[in-house]
């Protein structure tokens, strides 16, 4: 675990002609804020794809009013760092998107309006624990100067924050098999092993052998969903035994969501579901038009030509929310049965099945051939307590994935010559024979044993068996 930190140094006009107009005016004072989105790897991902490593929003900068006639200077910036915590290993290579947003503070109906001023993106290699890296990016006529670094949260160390350090138990050396933790030479590397069986999804540990549960889960291995129903009866069992949640101050208390947004708690914080026409962390963004690009993840914006008319986002499969901002985690419904692994491809769900099961949801037990387990049009045949594949012509192997030699079985009768063909095989018959497999003798008078030869085929011509 660790934190990616971003320090914005300046945002203003870039060098060269064509300085941009100031984003703020006496009539419309404004202030800036920034959003950073991180994704693992170096892939050229669309700006709309999810920020898999995390995202952060800065505080608002100081209010700025343009001086009439003056060129746009470097604009006043928010204080502090943008911090994106990451729970797992730091990937070493990452893609970033940094957006500069303008918040207009005029007396609009319904509060401040947001618009995107600039978006920069890049792909970088970065080791955790290293020094600040400086960068300059240009977006149109604007220039953004910033620094960034990734640092590990104790007890994690290393370039990926995967090694763990503990204070030494003895002053002189580390325990058997454990090395000193560079650069913290007074600490020792420690393998952090959670309690055996601790749920990888719902549990975590900060000390070896422990299993601490994320909110909403309980039990020694964090495998039991918290039940609130047993808390309702005043004479019911105590919360210590049932794992029921005792109400306390929650992140949704007082509803932090503005403009009629509804609040739901998440393991770490809260999430606002905004009514149409509003978005942002607390539904505070309004006055948005389709020109502002409010639909995320490839959503299609309809209507909303001016700030007074509402827009509608038509979301692509796999996304939902008034701005298509929420990824539908269809795998959380555990659609794959019998231990199958779920894969959400966006446009479809796929289940990877364990041995012995098949079908779109791994619902078929292959012992009884109920599932289609054979590739390339093969069919399943029962026998011996297991299934086998009877393969279509041209294929072989355990699941009909291997191309077979169609001539290997010598299918052409009466000395006919076999030729492999992309669609099957072709038999070139010896004189006196005809048919797909040269199985029919041609009578001396020229009539064949077949009722009639296909038009245009002379006896002895190669016959294709499809």
């Amino acid at each position: 675990a660790g934190v990616f930190e971003l320090q914005i140094h300046s945002f203003g006009p870039g060098p060269g002609p064509g300085a941009p107009r100031s984003p703020c005016s006496a009539r419309l004072p404004c202030r800036l804020f920034f959003r950073v989105c991180l994704k693992p790897g170096l892939s050229e991902e669309a700006a709309e794809s999810p920020c898999a490593l995390g995202a952060a929003l800065s505080a608002r900068g100081p209010v700025y009013t343009e001086q009439p006639g003056a060129p746009a200077p470097d604009l006043p910036l928010p204080d502090g760092l943008l911090q994106v915590p990451f729970r797992d290993a730091w990937p070493g290579t990452f893609s970033f998107i940094i957006e500069t947003w303008r918040e207009e503070l005029g007396d609009q109906i319904g509060g401040p309006a947001w618009s995107l001023l600039a978006r920069v993106a890049g792909r970088r290699r970065l080791a955790a624990g290293g020094p600040w890296a400086r960068d300059i990016q240009r977006a149109g006529a604007w220039e953004l100067r910033f620094s960034y670094r990734a640092r590990c949260e104790p007890p994690a160390v290393g370039t990926a924050c995967t090694r763990l350090c503990r204070p030494r138990s003895a002053p002189s050396r580390c325990g058997p098999g454990l090395r000193p933790c560079a650069p913290l030479e007074d600490e020792c590397e420690a393998p952090l092993v959670c309690r055996a069986g601790c749920s990888p999804e719902h549990g975590f540990c900060e000390q070896p052998g422990e299993c601490r549960c994320l909110e909403g889960w309980t039990g020694p291995l964090c495998t039991v969903p918290v039940s609130t129903s047993s808390c309702l009866s005043p004479r019911g069992p105590s919360s210590a035994t049932t794992g029921c949640l005792v109400p306390g101050p929650g992140p949704c208390d007082g509803n932090p969501c503005a403009n009629g947004g509804s609040c739901s708690e998440t393991p770490r914080s809260f999430e606002c579901t905004c009514p149409r026409g509003f978005y942002g962390l607390r539904c505070e963004v309004s006055g948005v038009t389709c020109a502002d690009g409010p639909c995320f993840n490839g959503g299609l914006c309809v209507g909303g030509a001016d700030p007074d008319s509402a827009y509608i986002c038509h979301c692509p499969p796999g996304f939902q929310g008034s701005n298509c901002e929420k990824r539908v985690d269809r795998c959380s419904l555990q659609p794959c049965r019998n231990g199958g692994l779920c894969l959400d491809l966006g446009h479809a769900l796929r289940c990877r099945c364990r041995a012995g099961f098949a079908g779109p949801r791994c619902e078929h037990d292959l012992d009884d051939c109920a599932g289609r387990a054979c590739a390339n049009g093969g069919t399943c045949v029962e026998g011996g307590g297991a299934h086998r594949c009877s393969c279509a012509l041209g294929f072989g192997g355990r699941d009909c994935r291997e191309r077979a030699d169609p001539c290997a079985a010598r299918p052409c009768a009466h000395g006919g010559r076999c030729y492999a063909h992309f669609s099957g095989l072709v038999c070139a018959c010896a004189p006196g024979y005809m048919g797909a497999r040269c199985e029919f003798p041609v009578h001396p008078d020229g009539a064949s044993a077949l009722p009639a030869a296909p038009p245009g085929l002379r006896p002895g011509d190669p016959q294709r068996y499809l």
């Epitope: 231990g339 796929r350 990877r352 364990r354 041995a355 599932g371 699941d399």
Partner: antibody, heavy 120, light 111 residues
Framework: QVQLVQSGAEVKKPGASVKVSCKAS????????IHWVRQAPGQGLEWMGW????????EYASKFQGRVTITADTSANTAYMELSSLRSEDTAVYYC?????????????WGQGTLVTVSS | DVQMTQSPSSLSASVGDRVTITCKSS???????????LNWLQQKPGQAPKLLLY???KLESGVPSRFSGSGSGTDYTLTISSLQPEDFATYYC????????FGQGTKLEIK
């Protein structure tokens, strides 16, 4: 014909990294998991991890966590295994293997193996 | 992690003999889906391993019927009913119920 062809033998110094490739033919790696298994000289087999090339999901054996990275280039139909911070005990033959068309957890088809020697 | 212990680590036998190799897991290999994910593989010197049996007793395609598997819970057995010259090799059990763990191997040699 389903085939996995691995890159050639490597000699590395302790502390270095090695990246072994595994090129698939006869099937699309997006349809299957690619597993990596190693075998030290005269020793048994050791499972290292797998990748689901469809979405890049990986699972690693706890012993190699943090030191091994399995990746895939679906356009080249090739999987890769990178092992860092090499030590002499990492000298081994490294195999890639793939599951069957219908189940992700059977090691049915194997590469020919790549010998990695770690020596100062 | 699940431990797999094979026995014996080596054994000598003659062509025609009936041979049994056992594999013991540190915890049950019965999956919640009702299947038991225990495989047996064969490896000859200088070659990659080859899958023989899966799901305890199911023969992989092309494997002779003299190979059979049995067992449940934590105890499993590979039996070769009548040894052939090509069967002299090293045999490994592999569990895939809880990730993947190989046994340490049993080397089958000619007596």
């Amino acid at each position: 014909q389903v085939q996995l062809v691995q890159s050639g033998a490597e000699v590395k110094k302790p502390g270095a990294s090695v990246k072994v490739s595994c090129k698939a033919s006869g099937f699309n790696i997006k349809d299957d998991y690619i597993h990596w298994v190693r075998q030290a000289p005269g020793q048994g087999l050791e499972w290292m991890g797998w990748i689901d090339s469809e979405n890049g999901d990986t699972e690693y054996a706890s012993k190699f966590q943090g030191r091994v990275t399995i990746t895939a280039d679906t356009s080249a139909n090739t999987a890769y295994m990178e092992l860092s911070s090499l030590r002499s005990e990492d000298t081994a033959v490294y195999y890639c293997a793939t599951s069957s068309y219908w189940s992700y957890d059977l090691l049915v088809y194997w590469g020919q193996g790549t010998l990695v020697t770690v020596s100062s | 992690d699940v431990q797999m212990t094979q026995s014996p680590s080596s054994l000598s036998a003659s062509v025609g003999d009936r041979v049994t190799i056992t594999c013991k897991s540190s915890q049950s290999l019965l999956h919640s889906n009702g299947k038991t994910y225990l495989n047996w593989l064969q490896q000859k010197p200088g070659q990659a391993p080859k899958l023989l049996l899966y799901l305890v007793s199911k023969l992989e395609s092309g494997v002779p019927s003299r190979f059979s598997g049995s067992g449940s819970g934590t105890d499993y057995t590979l039996t070769i009913s009548s040894l052939q010259p090509e069967d002299f090799a090293t045999y490994y059990c592999l569990q895939t119920t809880h990730l993947y763990t190989f046994g340490q191997g049993t080397k089958l040699e000619i007596k």
